[in-house]
């Protein structure tokens, strides 16, 4: 059904990562545009991307007016210069994606490690707190601003001489942990949100090393 | 708990109007597009209205659009439809119900009757 | 319109049987379906939405498949309180229901 020659989107997909959102779909347009709608479960219906040959529409706008709403996206599908042209139904032809919630669903980030400072046998291990995309009071929040104690970070780390590796974890960005005199550590971090059933962990952060550039050492 | 309450019905003449309320409780009613659906006498369901949570969209059955009106009062937690010219084939149970996107029903009131009779 | 039709529109069965309800859309609706059971003089109550995913709160023994233009609704052990009136709805394009089902004892 619908306009003739048009065909529907399909494989509608949600790719987030830290908030950044974008829906992608297929297939790639022959002599057809699409338009992108977006909503929470109001049913206020907001377009976006207009008539585009893409097939793809970036909606981190709309998603982070509230990361805890639930959205739904709805693809139409119009004939190349005859974007008034309607379906069978009496409107043109679309399909929904699934549904998306980005506070429980957003991938997290791979996370960095700031730096990482020892002061005796003690090292303090400080993760960068990334900024997102989500807005309150015209300021940008970082991932701990919105996941608040949702997220923990896991740090690994390890004897450069050794394959054994131990493992910390924190509900802020700081790690403090004992290692051995004179020897050096590699380090390596990945954020967690254990209350999630889906995408609870990040990808780990690049591993860093005492003796390169990040780390300070004081006795 | 998730209620709605519709209240307004009665017996109307035909060419008569009348104005049905739901009012709900246990959820943010601004959050949910809400909808009317009705069923008459020994017959199946019948969409009748739907509304967007702001209540900028508003959509209508063909068998009721320019005759019956959609409208809510977020501040008051309260769906409306305001039934003008009514005829005998829309006596029914009238049921207002919350409608995730506008799209689905997953809440439902225990519904109020419109006869419509001379 | 898309037109929704259900079959069979009676159904006597024994509790204990498994019931299949099938509903076929004019044009294809995808997976937007939903399946709702209604008792006498009471109000609908959602089953099923998105063809197959279980409301919460509703038993198990209710599932929902389908894709495209035909749908049904399983009933795996059918239970006294499973006693009523089933309709499907699509809302692919406005929305539209049924005919409905009603399932009687046997």
């Known amino acids: 059904s619908g306009t003739t020659n048009t065909v529907a989107a399909y494989n509608l997909t949600w790719k987030s990562t830290n908030f950044k959102t974008i829906l992608e779909w297929e297939p790639k347009p022959v002599n057809q545009v699409y338009t992108v709608q977006i909503s929470t479960k109001s049913g206020d219906w907001k377009s976006k991307c207009f008539y585009t040959t893409d097939t793809e529409c970036d909606l981190t706008d709309e998603i982070v007016k509230d990361v805890k709403q639930t959205y739904l996206a709805r693809v139409f599908s119009y004939p190349a210069g005859n974007v008034e042209s309607t379906g069978s139904a009496g409107e043109p032809l679309y399909e929904n994606s699934p549904e998306f919630t980005p506070y429980l669903e957003t991938n997290l980030g791979q996370p960095t490690i700031q730096s990482f400072e020892q002061v005796g046998t003690k090292v303090n291990v400080t993760v960068e707190d990334e900024r997102t995309l989500v807005r309150r009071n015209n300021t940008f929040l970082s991932l701990r601003d919105v996941f608040g104690k949702d997220l923990i970070y896991t740090l690994y780390y390890w004897k450069d001489s050794s394959t054994g590796r131990k493992t910390n974890t924190t509900h802020t960005n700081e790690f403090l942990i004992d290692v051995d005199k004179g020897e050096n550590y590699c380090f390596s971090v990945q954020a967690v949100i254990p209350s999630r059933t889906v995408n609870r962990k990040s990808t780990d952060s690049p591993v860093e090393c005492m003796g390169q550039e990040k780390g300070e050492f004081r006795e | 708990e998730v209620q709605l309450l519709e209240s307004g019905g009665g017996l109307v003449q035909p060419g008569g109007s009348l104005r049905l309320s739901c009012a709900a409780s246990?959820?943010?009613?601004?959050?949910?597009?809400m909808g009317w659906v009705r069923q008459a006498p020994g017959k199946g369901l019948e969409w009748v209205s739907t509304i967007s949570g702001s209540g900028g969209l508003t959509y209508y059955a063909d068998s009721v659009k320019g005759r019956f009106t959609i409208s809510r009062d977020n501040s008051k937690n309260t769906l409306y439809l305001q039934m003008n010219s009514l005829r005998a084939e829309d006596t029914a149970v009238y049921y207002c119900?919350?409608?995730?996107?506008?799209?689905?029903?997953?809440?439902w009131g225990k519904g109020t009757t419109v006869t419509v009779s001379s | 319109d898309i037109q929704m039709t259900q079959s069979p529109s009676t159904l006597s069965a024994s509790v204990g049987d498994r019931v299949t309800i099938t509903c076929r859309a004019s044009q294809s609706i995808s997976s937007w379906l939903a399946w709702y059971q209604q008792k006498p003089g009471k109000a609908p109550k959602l089953l099923i939405y998105?063809?197959?995913s279980l409301e919460s709160g509703v038993p198990s023994r209710f599932s929902g498949s389908g894709s495209g233009t035909e749908f049904t609704l399983t009933i795996s052990s059918l239970q006294p309180d499973d006693f009523a009136t089933y309709y499907c709805?699509?809302?692919?394009?406005?929305?539209?229901f049924g005919g409905g089902t009603k399932v009687e004892i046997k």
């Open positions: 998105k063809a197959s």
């Open positions: 709805q699509q809302y692919k394009s406005y929305i539209t």
């Open positions: 246990g959820f943010t009613f601004s959050d949910y597009a």
């Open positions: 119900a919350k409608a995730p996107y506008g799209y689905y029903m997953d809440v």
